[in-house]
């Protein structure tokens, strides 16, 4: 009382930091700093982030909240998790689509667009790896189909004459009836 020396940050508990004259307790996640504390080891005046803004971490200095990102509809993105006061919108791809990064060194914050997953069934192939972070990995042809060029061709139902070697190996059993 009545002194002129600003106190050191030797406040009880953690999360105090010098803001101007005094050591202040910071604001919790989801809140921004309206005004610093007015006395040693005091609480800063913190307000909840307005709608469509957020702050993910406790902080001493943010006087405004960050704007929530909007998912890029042009890139076929959808919101997997809506923005809250403590977390940004999490954008991703809807089921049946996968993330295609727009940069070579891909990290979580990299720009991306969504691509439809390959439908292995429509290609008459086994699904080897389901589509999620990358495109579907299709395997060998389904039963009743054989490899021909890049695709799977349906086994013939008539004579073996029109059935090449690979076809015969896969489809030969059909001709026993």
């Amino acid at each position: 009382q009545g002194g002129t020396r600003s106190p050191r940050c030797d406040c009880a508990g953690d999360f105090h930091k010098k803001i101007g004259l005094f050591c202040c307790r910071g604001c919790p996640a989801g809140h921004y700093l309206k005004a610093p504390c007015t006395e040693p080891c005091g609480n800063s005046t913190c307000l909840v982030c307005p709608q469509d803004t957020f702050l993910a971490w406790e902080n001493h200095h943010n006087s405004e909240c960050a704007r929530c990102q909007a998912c890029d509809e042009q890139a076929s993105q959808v919101a997997l998790e809506n923005c809250s006061a403590v977390a940004d919108t999490r954008c991703g791809c809807k089921p049946g689509w996968f993330v295609e990064c727009q940069v070579s060194q891909c990290v979580s914050s990299s720009p991306f667009y969504c691509q439809p997953c390959l439908d292995c069934g429509a290609l008459h192939r086994h699904t080897r790896l389901l589509c999620s972070r990358r495109d579907t990995d299709c395997g060998t042809c389904l039963p009743g189909f054989y490899e021909h060029g890049d695709g799977c061709v349906s086994c013939p139902t008539s004579t073996l004459g029109s059935c090449p070697e690979r076809c015969a190996a896969v489809c030969g059993w059909r001709q026993m009836f």
Epitope: G3, G20, L21, F22, T38, E39, T45
Partner: antibody, heavy 116, light 107 residues
């Protein structure tokens, strides 16, 4: 609109006393630290005292310690400066200012003249 | 106490000129520095806080920079209404202290 209006200034003889008031409006007074800053005629600005938002912490410049007392009444949105044993060198315009360090709003000032 | 040394104490410049005022603290004050404008017979007005943060409503021709002990205040293009005395002020430590002021005049 934030407003700070000082009153209580005037002429006083050396050794006399005055009580300055600062009426605050347009903001939540009880959330802010407040200061008194003075300016002698033709001179620069001198911070003299600070009080925390609750009134629980007060600080003074060495030049006025033991002579001036800062106080506040949050119910009345008012800040005060009790000035005793006034000397000629206390002649100045006295401003109340809002903030805990950086002063974003100031009153218009009240002139205190100490002269025999 | 932290001593704030402002220079120059006065300066004369023409409309449109770039004007620079410096402020030096006697010890490290981080970025806890404000700049004020005071016109004759009026209360000071806060222009810049935290060394470089322009207050709402203050024209963008005013700017501040610096950290530690050396700070600069700049008016990029002097206007007639900028004629005033300018003060720096530290709030890193009590007692709060001001520079002695810089009186700005038009040539």
């Amino acid at each position: 609109e934030v407003q700070l209006v000082e009153s209580g200034g005037g002429s006083v003889q050396p050794g006399g006393s005055l009580r300055l008031s600062c009426a605050a409006s347009g903001f939540t007074f009880s959330s802010y630290g407040m200061s008194w800053v003075r300016q002698a005629p033709g001179k620069g600005l001198e911070w003299i005292s600070y009080i925390s938002s609750s009134g629980g912490h007060t600080y003074y410049a060495d030049s006025v310690k033991g002579q001036f007392t800062i106080s506040r009444d949050n119910a009345k949105n008012s800040l005060y400066l009790q000035m005793n044993s006034l000397r000629a060198e206390d002649t100045a315009v006295y401003y109340c200012a809002r903030g805990s360090g950086s002063f974003d709003y100031w009153g218009q000032g009240t002139l205190v003249t100490v002269s025999s | 106490d932290i001593v704030m040394t402002q220079s120059p104490s006065s300066l004369s410049a023409s409309v449109g000129d770039r004007v620079t005022i410096t402020c030096q603290a006697s010890q490290d004050i981080s970025n806890y520095l404000s700049w004020y404008q005071q016109k004759p017979g009026k209360a000071p007005k806060l222009l810049i806080s935290d060394a470089s943060n322009l207050e709402t409503g203050v024209p963008s021709r005013f700017s501040g920079s610096g950290s530690g002990t050396d700070f600069t205040f700049t008016i990029s293009s002097l206007q007639p209404e900028d004629i005033a005395t300018y003060y720096c002020q530290q709030y890193d430590n009590l007692p709060i202290t001001f520079g002695q002021g810089t009186r700005l005049e038009i040539k």
